[in-house]
Amino acid sequence: APVRSLNCTLRDSQQKSLVMSGPYELKALHLQGQDMEQQVVFSMSFVQGEESNDKIPVALGLKEKNLYLSCVLKDDKPTLQLESVDPKNYPKKKMEKRFVFNKIEINNKLEFESAQFPNWYISTSQAENMPVFLGGTKGGQDITDFTMQFVSS
């Protein structure tokens, strides 16, 4: 059977939404009203990996696009990117590790930890209109907590 994928949107803990910024970058900013239609809809796939009640391995693709969030080393630093894939082969149950995030939910906080780089998290800046990135610190200035809104396919 193919991997199960569900559509969702994400907002950071300051209620910033995620939108496309150019072809291969996401940025976070506050949206209201009709502007909410700009927000990215993810296709979240439940993939193979170590799982617990609080931690579920997922891949985050962009709905109806052959783009996935992935974590790679750039200049020796773990980096978040949007990677183009062959739509005939993705999504799949056994995703390469760079595409896998541990969706961790504890006490109303939802984090996305890179499976490739433990303790590195999908992050946003406090400032408006800044890129979504992979951050190596929790509880600092940068935001690593999100809420998730599932949407009908």
């Epitope: 059977a1 193919p2 199960r4 569900l6 559509n7 969702c8 439940f46 009640n53 609080d54 579920i56 939910e105 504890i106 006490n107 109303n108 906080k109 939802l110 907590d145 999100f146 809420t147 998730m148 809104q149 599932f150 949407v151 009908s152 396919s153």
Partner: antibody
């Protein structure tokens, strides 16, 4: 005993609001995703709201999106459904159920609380 | 949305009979299917999930199977306490939807 007990149902006029509660006991509430499922008189079942175990994830079908809000208080083992701008078609028995988006099915149900929307 | 169509909508059978209820999905749901039993005036009860896995405490006379997009609930030997309405529900894509129900009566 493992159980869910709903309360808060009643008769309400169209356009008004109602808040349902569901009290959980006999299991570790904070470890489970929860949902509300409704059943109109003589009809089938419709899933109307979901919240993840910590409260960070939600889902609403188009029929109630923007009108219903699900929430939970894990310290009090309680699930809520705030229903605003109620319509006649929201008349139903509302069940609290354990389960949701990830697991996909509902393995424990409450007895239901009836909501009637009528002028 | 994926539509779930149950058949028959109602049926009568005798104690000891083998009973089958079918649920047809409007698209492929890859065994992400659940069956519930709802006795009159009560809450639904989980019977089967993942198309064929029996829920805890459910008698072994209940079983689930599938062929393509058709899913079947079978009661091998009908008992008086099985009088109920049976619902299927898929959980492949959102929204997860239920069938319209099959009302089972004893003749």
């Amino acid at each position: 005993e493992v159980q869910l007990v709903e309360s808060g149902g009643g008769v309400v006029q169209p356009g008004r609001s109602l808040r349902l509660s569901c009290s959980a006991s006999g299991f570790i509430f904070s470890r489970y995703d929860m949902s509300w499922v409704r059943q109109a008189p003589g009809k089938g079942l419709e899933w109307v709201a979901y919240i993840s175990h910590g409260g960070a994830g939600t889902y609403y079908p188009d029929s109630v999106k923007g009108r219903f809000t699900i929430s939970r208080d894990n310290s009090k083992n309680t699930l809520f459904l705030q229903m605003d701008s109620l319509r006649a078609e929201d008349t139903a028995v509302y069940f609290c159920a354990r389960g949701g988006v990830y697991k996909g099915y509902f393995d424990l149900w409450g007895q239901g609380t009836p909501v009637t929307v009528s002028s | 949305d994926i539509q779930m169509t149950q058949s028959p909508s109602s049926l009568s059978a005798s104690v000891g009979d083998r009973v089958t209820i079918t649920c047809r999905a409007s698209g492929n749901i890859y065994h992400y299917l659940t069956w519930y039993q709802q006795t009159p005036g009560k809450a639904p009860k989980l019977l089967i999930y993942n198309a064929k896995t029996l829920a805890s405490g459910v008698p072994s006379r209940f079983s689930g199977s599938s062929s393509g997009t058709d899913y079947t609930l079978t009661i091998s030997s009908l008992q008086p306490e099985d009088i109920a309405t049976y619902y299927c529900q898929h959980f492949w894509k959102l929204p997860y939807t239920f069938g319209q129900g099959t009302k089972l009566q004893i003749t």
